[in-house]
Interface confidence: low
């Protein structure tokens, strides 16, 4: 479905899993959850983009929510695709390490 969240991309959740492809819904991009498993494709809901989770196991597809774009999790496993939802792009978790 199409989500009409913020016009930014979500940042990674503290439990979201890492992903190579991040999927997002709203106008932002979601970030990974801290406990989510790593994924190649991360899925999220809002208009943001998801980021990998710090403790989640590695996965190929991660799901997230907002309209933002996800940011990397500090301990999340590697992933190729991250999925998020809102129209924004996710940002990293509060404890996530700096992104390169």
């Amino acid at each position: 479905g199409v989500t009409s969240a913020p016009d930014t991309r979500p940042a990674p959740g503290s439990t979201a899993p890492p992903a190579h492809g991040v999927t997002s819904a709203p106008d932002t991009r979601p970030a990974p959850g801290s406990t989510a498993p790593p994924a190649h494709g991360v899925t999220s809901a809002p208009d943001t983009r998801p980021a990998p989770g710090s403790t989640a196991p590695p996965a190929h597809g991660v799901t997230s929510a907002p309209d933002t774009r996800p940011a990397p999790g500090s301990t999340a496993p590697p992933a190729h695709g991250v999925t998020s939802a809102p129209d924004t792009r996710p940002a990293p978790g509060s404890t996530a390490p700096p992104a390169h």
Epitope: A19, H40, A45, R69, P72, S74
Partner: antibody, heavy 128, light 112 residues
């Protein structure tokens, strides 16, 4: 070889419909977010629509909202753009584009958010 | 929406000489994750666009080192240290920090 091949373009009258297709090969299509980006004759680039790797999340430019629908079939490695109520201003070359969000390794994730693979485009002409 | 403004519109350059293209965004492109998702694309005549630079200054695979990107916040620059004949085309900046994704109007690089 990583490749995106668009098809389905053509000449259509205002108010008409077209369905564009994009065949992906050389990479794991279901891992990537995809977008449609268009370029009117002699003009710049305009992002049209975006779809998450699973197909659950979709975004549209205001200029096409309510008229265009993006979808994908990961089993067929294909991306689609259903275009209805076409207008003269929709005339453009439509590109199928792969977006790389980044990768994670060793507990660290690195985000890119870049458009790294572009098809050659398919031309849509809306004219009476 | 974030508006991307490029200057100049056209840049006639002598072969072997440097070229510089500016891109300014209507608001900061720094994402909440600390990254700045600003890319540069090259479109040669009759071809689709091609990624050159991502996240301000990172050269994409296969891109010659004569291309470099710099900037921060709202002001960004693409530089070609020594223009070659194959560099002729239109260059676009693009932001991927926020939806809708938006592009600059393009700068045409041509040989004098």
């Amino acid at each position: 070889q990583v490749q995106l091949v668009e098809s389905g373009g053509g000449l259509v009258k205002p108010g008409g419909s077209l369905r564009l297709s994009c065949a992906a090969s050389g990479f794991t299509f279901s891992d990537y977010y995809m977008s449609w980006i268009r370029q009117a004759p002699g003009k710049g680039l305009e992002w049209v629509s975006y779809i998450s790797s699973s197909g659950t999340t979709k975004y549209y430019a205001d200029s096409v909202k309510g008229r265009f629908t993006i979808s994908r079939d990961n089993a067929k490695n294909s991306l689609y753009l259903q275009m209805n109520s076409l207008r003269a201003e929709d005339t453009a070359v439509y590109y199928c584009v792969r977006e790389n969000l980044g990768y994670c390794t060793g507990g660290n994730c690195f985000y890119y958010y870049y458009m790294d693979v572009w098809g050659k485009g398919t031309t849509v002409t809306v004219s009476s | 929406d974030i508006v991307m403004t490029q200057t100049p519109l056209s840049s006639p350059v002598t072969l072997g000489q440097p070229a510089s293209i500016s891109c300014r965004s209507s608001q900061s492109l720094v994402h909440s994750d600390g990254n700045t998702y600003l890319s540069w694309l090259q479109q040669r005549p009759g071809q689709p666009p091609r990624l050159l630079i991502y996240k301000i200054s990172n050269r994409f695979s296969g891109v010659p080192d004569r291309f470099s990107g710099s900037g921060a916040g709202t002001d960004f620059t693409l530089k070609i240290s020594r223009v070659e004949a194959e560099d002729v085309g239109v260059y676009y900046c693009m932001q991927a920090t926020q939806f809708p994704l938006t592009f600059g109007g393009g700068t045409k690089v041509e040989i004098k």
